[in-house]
Amino acid sequence: GTINVHDVETQFNQYKTEAASRYNLTISDVSVSDVPFPFSAQSGA
C-alpha cells in the first residue's frame, strides 16, 4: 500500500503533543524531505 505523507505528518503531530503532555518530552521536528538526490530516478511523474 501507499503511505500519504500528510497523514503521517498529522499522526506525528498528535504523538508530539501527547509526548509533551504525558511524558514531558519535546520533539522538535522530523524532516520527510531530507533525502539524498535520487540519481537512480527514472523518467515519468
Epitope: S31, S33, D34, V35, F37, F39, A41, Q42, S43, A45
Partner: antibody, heavy 122, light 106 residues
C-alpha cells in the same frame, strides 16, 4: 506565491570572498532541496551546488568544490552560498532555484529567483 | 561528465510554425528537464522528467525521448515563445545543462 530573492552580489577582486543569500517565501522551506545555478554573460547555465531539505546532503561540481560552501537556515528561511578564492571565471549571475526532488523522483528546478550579479575583477 | 549538445543552435521560425529542438547526451541518461529563458529574464521550468508539463505551462509544449536523444516540441509558436531553451540532465553528477537553442523570429 513562491518567491526567491537573491542578494549579496557585487564586485570583488580575484582571491576575494563573497556570501550570497537567497530569501525564500511562499512554501515550506525545509521540505525542499535548494540549488545555486550561475550564468556567465552570454553563456549557458551552470550548476553550482545543491543542498537537501534538511541540509544533510550537499553536492558540488569539481569547478567549485573546496572553494564554495552551500548552507541553509530552516528556522529563518535563507539559503547561503559562501564563495572563497574567487576567480575571474566565477563572474556570472547567480540564481537560487527551488529544487523539487524526493527519494525516488526528480521534478526539476521549479521556481527561480531574479539572480544576483557577481563580478570578479581586479 | 555528461555533455549535452543542443541543435540547432538557432532556429528561425514564424509565429504559428512548429518548432523541434533536440538535446543529445554523450552517454545515456534516464530523463531530462527543459527550461525556457526569455531575454533579460530568469530561467523557467517547462518540462520535467522528459515529458511532464510543469505547472502553468501551456499544452503546446511537449517533450519526448530516451537514452541519449531527447526532443522538445512547440506545436504552434506564440510570440512569447521566442527565447532560449536549455535541457538539463541529473542522472549523474555533475548536473549539466545543454548549450542552448535560441528560437528567434524569422
Amino acid at each position: 506565491e513562491v518567491q526567491l530573492v537573491e542578494s549579496g552580489g557585487g564586485l570583488v577582486k580575484p582571491g576575494g570572498s563573497l556570501r550570497l543569500s537567497c530569501a525564500a517565501s511562499g512554501f515550506t522551506f525545509s521540505r525542499y532541496g535548494m540549488s545555486w545555478v550561475r550564468q556567465a554573460p552570454g553563456k549557458r547555465l551552470e550548476w553550482v551546488s545543491t543542498i537537501s531539505g534538511g541540509g544533510t546532503y550537499i553536492y558540488y561540481p569539481d569547478s567549485v568544490k573546496g572553494r564554495f560552501t552551500i548552507s541553509r537556515d530552516n528556522a529563518k528561511n535563507p539559503l547561503y552560498l559562501q564563495m572563497n578564492s574567487l576567480r575571474a571565471e566565477d563572474t556570472a549571475v547567480y540564481y537560487c532555484p527551488r529544487d523539487n526532488y524526493g527519494r525516488n523522483y526528480d521534478y526539476g528546478m521549479d521556481y527561480w529567483g531574479q539572480g544576483t550579479l557577481v563580478t570578479v575583477s581586479s | 561528465e555528461i555533455v549535452l549538445t543542443q541543435s540547432p543552435a538557432t532556429l528561425s521560425l514564424s509565429p504559428g510554425e512548429r518548432a523541434t529542438l533536440t538535446c543529445s547526451a554523450t552517454s545515456s541518461v534516464s530523463y531530462i528537464h527543459w527550461y525556457q529563458q526569455r531575454p533579460g529574464q530568469s530561467p523557467r521550468l517547462l518540462i520535467y522528467s522528459t515529458s511532464n508539463l510543469a505547472s502553468g505551462i501551456p499544452a503546446r509544449f511537449s517533450g519526448s525521448g530516451s537514452g541519449s536523444d531527447y526532443t522538445l516540441t512547440i506545436s504552434s509558436l506564440e510570440p512569447e515563445d521566442f527565447a532560449v531553451y536549455y535541457c538539463q540532465q541529473r542522472s549523474s553528477s555533475p548536473f549539466t545543462f545543454g548549450s542552448g537553442t535560441k528560437v528567434e523570429i524569422k
